[in-house]
Interface confidence: medium
Amino acid sequence: TALSPAPTTMDFTPAPLEDTSSRPQFCKWPCECPPSPPRCPLGVSLITDGCECCKMCAQQLGDNCTEAAICDPHRGLYCDYSGDRPRYAIGVCAQVVGVGCVLDGVRYNNGQSFQPNCKYNCTCIDGAVGCTPLCLRVRPPRLWCPHPRRVSIPGHCCEQWVCEDDAKRPRKTAPRDTGAFDAVGEVEAWHRNCIAYTSPWSPCSTSCGLGVSTRISNVNAQCWPEQESRLCNLRPCDVDIHTLIKAGKKCLAVYQPEASMNFTLAGCISTRSYQPKYCGVCMDNRCCIPYKSKTIDVSFQCPDGLGFSRQVLWINACFCNLSCRNPNDIFADLESYPDFSEIAN
């Protein structure tokens, strides 16, 4: 393929003033291929070379790459020519980096942590913003406070529980030593003790067909928020579920095809078949979303012999309600995430 300057940073490094060497030619036409394709080590993709001529074992992370010897696309690698600027001759296979994020008109770099307000600490990971609440969810006392409610306290960021007492004015639900921290205390506690936190899964990125759902968890050695992702398919795009709603009913909460099926992803097929349930639809303004769900691990096999697995949303039950959230409101799920463990995860 043609010569093209390689990825560099915004400032251009001048090439050496004198260079009489020739750029090597990596592709030859007509194609010259060995009689049989190579056998690749376990986990290495067998792909067509960059000359679109012969089968080759894809170059792996850290390997040299050229227009002919290309990096393993199944492993998210690309040929980084920045060390050969801007000759575009020999590069090194590197990991594709995530793109940045835009939130409320502000651009953040991939991996950047930021606080959009006092209630959340957010991280940009590969184009998705994941946020962890800085205001800890202390449950209201169930026994001695009949009417707890959360109120904003002037000068404090986080809302606090107060106990509505019919006879008296509202009072705080607990004395200072029972864990009802103020905003500063909560932030300090978060950083000092590393309170384990896993956010709920975000809504599926598509309302039908294959999408992605993400969550942020700091359950790791560094106590650093990392993004997990799973595939999701709330409902098929090619089935008109409206036609399946029974006469006199306004909704079909769950749709389950009769036949089992294999999942497909990027030309690769799941190693076993499944009979998934999908969320249905309503005739009115209500929307149907997963109510009981879990995450399953699905193994895929590719035509070139490569195998991999992905986490996938498995729907057990859906419910239809009017709170159809704005998919662009990234805080919506965090504001009112469910306390029922069977709804999340």
């Epitope: 393929t1 300057p5 990825p7 001048p14 040929c79 801007p86």
Partner: antibody
Framework: EVQLVQSGAEVKKPGASVKVSCKAS????????INWVRQATGQGPEWLGW????????GNAQNFQGRVFMTWDTSKDTAYMEMSSLRSDDTAVYYC??????WGQGTLVTVSS | DIVMTQTPSSLSASVGDRVTITCRAS??????LNWYQQKPGKAPKLLIY???SLQSGVPSRFSGSRSGTDFTLTITNVQPEDFATYYC?????????FGQGTKVEIK
């Protein structure tokens, strides 16, 4: 088959901005640079800059620094080139090119009051 | 910036002729030079890369050579579909620069 399909022609007023899209297919989008080149009628091509969706890096020609903004969407295998503060001499056909070998069909941008 | 000086700016030829177009770089660019063909209303099409490597699918009547900072595109046995404008491009250093073009017309 490698293909780059660009968005349709645009007519803009001076001072406005334009955003041209370039949808890639037939290859792994993150593995190659996308270069942006423009060509005014009867003139030779002029290079604007490049982006690499794999590394997340971009670089502009000096003349266009601060006026050309290149972005991409890996989920759509699409690159974008946005040019702001348009002037009448920005009237040209804008091309995207994969590593300078495969080119899009071009997008005519006309800047006129 | 590296300046690419392309000559001639236009030439006339007949079918079957041999045509030569040259490009001179203002400094050494090794062999980091591409040649393109462009027809009216169409995008440039890559013919030769790395000064002398023929792009896949391009007829063998097109060839390229290099002598120091001088580069030559040769079309032997010109065909009717070869009448177009040809550009050289250097990809040795940023910014990428093009020659001003050579229009090959029918005599």
């Amino acid at each position: 088959e490698v293909q780059l399909v660009q968005s349709g022609a645009e007519v803009k007023k001076p001072g406005a901005s334009v955003k041209v899209s370039c949808k890639a297919s037939g290859y792994t989008f993150t593995s190659y640079d996308i270069n942006w080149v423009r060509q005014a009628t009867g003139q030779g091509p002029e290079w604007l800059g490049w982006l690499n969706p794999g590394s997340g890096k971009t670089g502009n020609a000096q003349n266009f620094q601060g006026r050309v903004f290149m972005t991409w969407d890996t989920s759509k295998d699409t690159a974008y080139m946005e040019m702001s503060s348009l002037r009448s001499d920005d009237t040209a056909v804008y091309y995207c090119a994969r590593n300078l070998d495969y080119w899009g069909q071009g997008t005519l941008v006309t800047v006129s009051s | 910036d590296i300046v690419m000086t392309q000559t001639p700016s236009s030439l006339s030829a007949s079918v079957g002729d041999r045509v030569t177009i040259t490009c001179r770089a203002s400094q050494s660019i090794s062999s980091y030079l591409n040649w393109y063909q462009q027809k009216p209303g169409k995008a440039p099409k890559l013919l030769i890369y790395a000064a002398s490597s023929l792009q896949s699918g391009v007829p063998s009547r097109f060839s390229g050579s290099r002598s120091g900072t001088d580069f030559t595109l040769t079309i032997t046995n010109v065909q009717p579909e070869d009448f177009a404008t040809y550009y050289c491009l250097q990809a040795y250093d940023f910014p990428i620069t093009f020659g001003q073009g050579t229009k090959v017309e029918i005599k």
